[in-house]
Interface confidence: low
Amino acid sequence: FTITVSKDLYVVEYGGNVTMECKFPVEKQLNLFALIVYWEMEDKKIIQFVNGKEDLKVQHSSYSQRAQLLKDQLFLGKAALQITDVRLQDAGVYCCLIGYGGADYKRITLKVHAPYRNISQRISVDPVTSEHELMCQAEGYPEAEVIWTSSDHRVLSGKTTITNSNREEKLFNVTSTLNINATANEIFYCTFQRSGPEENNTAELVIPERLPVPASERTHFMILGPFLLLLGVVLAVTFCLKKHGRMMDVEKCCTRDRNSKKRNDIQFEET
């Protein structure tokens, strides 16, 4: 009794599906009640098929709702383990053990990688300095550095931060920003380069003709703030003079106004 595998190395991308197969000899009609199929990954039980049915009680929680034995394939002499929504933690060495009048087992390696494929990008402009801030963000594994380049192949200096993804513990969330004085239609590239030689992933950022007026109050305040403050001071002083007509009250009133201006500044920095 010998199990065979057509492949003992499977490669799958994070979030994808994989079906790993072990073949066993079946003569004529399969007797399900004489068949034992175990699939394990290291110390984790994934499938325990005994007496014609799967025992889900023993299934490791990390494979719950994601791993199943394809029953229709059993009749073709295949113990096929399907894993959906593959995670980085699924990488490792799997063992299929089959008992059917004899017993044998085979090992299969599953490798999982996560390219930094979906690169989010954003371009914003500082209305005071007219400097552009370019941002690229993506998730993947293993850690990546981000290389910024211009259309004339100059390497530019960006700032990259790496955090753990909210989606999965082992996944990295890489964000990189580049501050640069740029003109309309200039092209910049951010390239996510993983340690090791996996394919690099690149996004192209084109400086727009004119950035739309930002919706954020902060930007409005940066433009209108000084003008409004000046107007406020003038009105307050006028009000104080009219109402009290005394220098001391003007001073008090203006002191209060200075405090409120301070609060505005703080608010502006926090916005």
């Epitope: 003992d8 490792g92 090992r107 090791g196």
Partner: antibody, heavy 118, light 113 residues
């Protein structure tokens, strides 16, 4: 950056055993397959097998089954290969090589020369 | 086991010339799941460790000069070194990492004319 530092040259007697080490740094040791490769003087490269340090799982080239034993110590990020019942045929340079994700053998140690001689 | 053959066993070139190294496998190295050929090229200079040049038959490793170009698919593969430099003189091995045991070719020695 990634580095694989192997132990020094060994001169051993026929019939004895030798254990060579490969200390990894600059990457997550447990998540890469660590391979071992043999190269005899003037000869090509021969794949011995790999160990997956996270679980200690091994895969051997049948030719080296029983000859080589691969182990790993996660705490020190070190992989080991023990060669037993040594003969002159085992005289060679042995490399450890780390496999990055799904891509060939990317990072290599400097090699350990094992000479079997009485 | 998958057998890998390389030709020529040695080749002598002058600096600035282009050289083509061949590698053949006894069975296809194309992996249907991702349509990639699991073949790598390695450069080994005398007394040094092998250095990976090409992975997936055509992809250059980080830092490898673009004068090294890998091509081919299935069972026939080629490494082209254009405008050979003195530092390129070395042994070149191709190896498959699709099927266990992983196997390497016997190598091609690149020498100066």
């Amino acid at each position: 950056q990634v580095q694989l530092q192997q132990s020094g040259a060994e001169l051993v007697k026929p019939g004895s055993s030798v254990k060579i080490s490969c200390k990894a740094s600059g990457y997550t040791f447990t998540s890469n397959f660590m391979h071992w490769v043999k190269q005899q003087p003037g000869n090509g490269l021969e794949w011995i097998g790999w160990i997956y340090p996270e679980y200690g799982n091994t895969k051997y080239n049948q030719k080296f089954d029983g000859k080589a034993t691969l182990t790993a110590d996660k705490s020190s990020s070190t992989a080991y290969m023990q060669l037993s019942s040594l003969t002159s045929e085992d005289s060679a340079v042995y490399f450890c090589a780390s496999e990055e994700a799904v891509i060939s053998l990317v990072y290599w140690g400097q090699g350990t020369l094992v000479t079997v001689s009485s | 086991d998958i057998a890998i053959t390389q030709s020529p066993s040695s080749v002598a070139v002058s600096v600035g010339e282009t050289v083509t190294l061949s590698c053949k496998s006894s069975q296809s190295l194309l992996y249907s799941e991702n349509q990639k050929d699991y073949l790598g090229w390695y450069q080994q200079k005398p007394g040094q460790t092998p250095k990976p040049l090409i992975y997936w038959a055509t992809n250059r490793h980080t830092g490898v000069p673009d004068r090294f170009t890998g091509s081919g698919s299935g069972t026939d593969f080629t490494l082209i070194i254009s405008s050979v430099q003195a530092e390129d003189l070395a042994d070149y091995y191709c190896g498959q990492y699709l099927v266990y045991p992983f196997t390497f070719g016997p190598g091609t020695k690149l020498e100066l004319k």
